[in-house]
């Protein structure tokens, strides 16, 4: 147990105010009650506390709710969220978008990242969803935060609100999360002509499958090299020659920068040299010439299958 | 279940001491605010005393403060009030109760034990 | 301190009839913190209403509360023959917790 302080007479705290930044760390200790800070949350932010009178005030509200901050306190931490942990936020149940609009203002230039992913984790578990309120509060308080959703939170997404989603809103999108939200994008923009489909799409393709870059590539879309190097990797590989270079129209000449990175690397090591040499761009690595191209995964599925056999 | 059972009432004389215990079980005591509430024969409630789980902070009501003392025991469960200097309007049962913060209410009471302050 | 002020006294009803029973604050109180106990001859007080309107585990549903502010009300939609006892109300901030006196609910 915290040794215990009594606190002096002439500093007990009846409301909280500003002559509580005069008082020591053990003095806050003592003489605020917890429920009276609870309930007087929307005070603290305006009284400039040091980040040590801050973390009393915090050990307060622990002490006080153990099982996790309401939301009627929540809502109102100002500064003091920065105090907080993910471990703590994971406690939390927060359905209103005014307190994530206003815990998301807060965490503003600081190095929030994690507490702001457990944040919006905790928004979506309150609400049920990812609904369109959610996405668009995020998107403009919040851009790239998308993505700092678990794929199992993406998973709840309507494919409704995918339209609300901006380009920029996906930068920071790995590949598992993409995974969930591809098949989304492509049902809310399935009535959309091919152009119009492509410019929508793009920016979710890094979750495609071959099938639907094939596809893609007999539209005439012109992808950008930036878009083909987000691709998955397993989806590039089996792409012909002849698909890359409709797919990427063009912007075909831009594999020779890229051929060194992944997944433009992985496909060449893949195609024969004589394929790439249609390119003309000087390509290098490929099967040569009177090769014999064995699919390894099918080589390893017939030998598995005598084994057991 | 939630458990709270008061202990150490009796007859006192004015100006005397008497320390009550509260044991508590059922919840994780170490967590929970923890309150004592007083009740004149054939009167109305009233609060004595508070104390936090941690930094055992402790709040009393003016009526009181100075002559008792709210502590707590987190190893053994145990809620205590130490009074001292009692007096014949101190006669009253003696409530342990358990301060949810989430409700802000007392939302569990022990039975209660009696004190008695009489020459 | 916050005085909290219950009306009437006495209530004598009838099983059955409905029951209102009120509690004035002398100051403003959020109702977050206004809580609502019954409590029976002999018996220590229970828990019924929190944060003014929530009914608290295990508290039939002929029980509400309401109000904010300076006013708040406990309502017994049909009293039962367990319901006659006394009420108080009660605020839990700022300190001191206060108590109102009390109000009797009896059998008319």
């Known amino acids: 147990d915290v040794e215990r302080t009594t606190c002096p007479p002439e500093k007990e705290v009846h409301e909280i105010d500003e002559s509580l930044i005069f008082y020591k760390k053990r003095e806050l200790e003592a003489c605020v009650d917890a429920a009276l800070l609870a309930a007087q949350m929307d005070r603290v932010d305006a009284i400039p506390f040091t980040y040590e009178q801050l973390d009393v005030l915090k050990h307060k509200l622990d002490e006080l709710y153990p099982q996790g901050y309401p939301e009627s306190v929540i809502r109102h931490l100002g500064h003091l969220f920065l105090k907080m942990s993910p471990e703590d936020i994971r406690k939390w149940n927060v359905t209103s978008l005014e307190t994530l609009k206003a815990l998301l203002k807060v965490s503003k230039g600081h190095e929030m990242s994690a507490q702001v992913a457990t944040l919006i984790d905790r928004v979506v578990v309150g609400r049920g969803q990812l609904d369109k309120d959610t996405a668009d509060t995020l998107t403009a308080f919040c851009p790239g935060c998308l993505c700092s959703l678990s794929p199992e939170r993406l998973s709840s997404v309507p494919p409704s609100i995918i339209g609300a989603v901006r380009p920029q809103d996906l930068d920071t999108c790995g590949p598992r999360q993409l995974d969930v939200l591809y098949p989304k994008a492509r049902l809310a923009f399935q009535n959309m002509s091919g152009s119009e489909y492509f410019v929508k799409i793009r920016p979710f393709l890094g979750g495609a499958p071959t099938e639907d870059l094939k596809a893609l590539s007999q539209q005439n879309v012109s992808m950008d090299l930036a878009t083909f190097m987000k691709l998955r990797r397993e989806a590039v590989l089996p792409l012909s020659v002849a698909e890359v270079q409709k797919l990427l129209g063009p912007h075909v000449e831009g594999l020779k920068v890229e051929e060194q990175h992944s997944p433009v690397r992985d496909w060449i090591l893949k195609q024969r040299q004589d394929d790439l040499d249609t390119l003309g761009l000087g390509l290098q690595g490929g099967i040569p010439n009177g090769y014999l191209i064995l699919d390894l995964s099918v080589r390893e599925a017939l030998s598995h299958h005598h084994h057991h056999h | 279940e939630v458990q709270l059972l008061e202990s150490g009432g009796g007859l006192v004389q004015p100006g005397g001491s008497l320390r009550l215990s509260c044991a508590a079980s059922?919840?994780?005591?170490?967590?929970?605010?923890m309150s004592w509430v007083r009740q004149a024969p054939g009167k109305g409630l009233e609060w004595v005393s508070n104390?936090?789980?941690?930094?055992?902070?402790?709040n009393y009501a003016d009526s009181v403060k100075g002559r008792f003392t709210i502590s707590r025991d987190n190893n053994k469960n145990t809620l205590y009030l130490q009074m001292n200097s009692l007096r014949a309007e101190d006669t009253a049962v003696y409530y342990c109760?358990?301060?949810?913060?989430?409700?802000?209410?007392?939302?569990?009471w022990g039975q209660g034990t009696l004190v008695t302050v009489s020459s | 301190e916050i005085v909290l002020t219950q009306s009437p006294g006495t209530l004598s009803l009838s099983p059955g009839e409905r029951a209102t029973l009120s509690c004035r604050a002398s100051?403003?109180?959020?109702?977050?913190?206004l809580a609502w106990y019954q409590q029976k001859p002999g018996q220590a007080p229970r828990l019924l209403i929190y944060?003014?309107?929530s009914r608290a585990t295990g508290i039939p549903d002929r029980f509400s509360g309401s109000g904010s502010g300076t006013d708040f009300t406990l309502t017994i939609s049909r009293l039962e023959p367990e319901d006659f006892a006394v009420y108080y109300c009660?605020?839990?901030?700022?300190?001191?917790?206060?108590f109102g006196q009390g109000t009797k609910v009896e059998i008319k």
């Open positions: 944060g003014a309107s």
């Open positions: 059922g919840f994780t005591f170490t967590h929970t605010y």
């Open positions: 100051q403003s109180v959020s109702s977050s913190y």
């Open positions: 009660q605020q839990t901030v700022p300190y001191p917790y206060t």
């Open positions: 109760a358990r301060y949810n913060a989430y409700h802000a209410a007392l939302d569990y």
């Open positions: 104390i936090s789980p941690t930094y055992s902070t402790t």
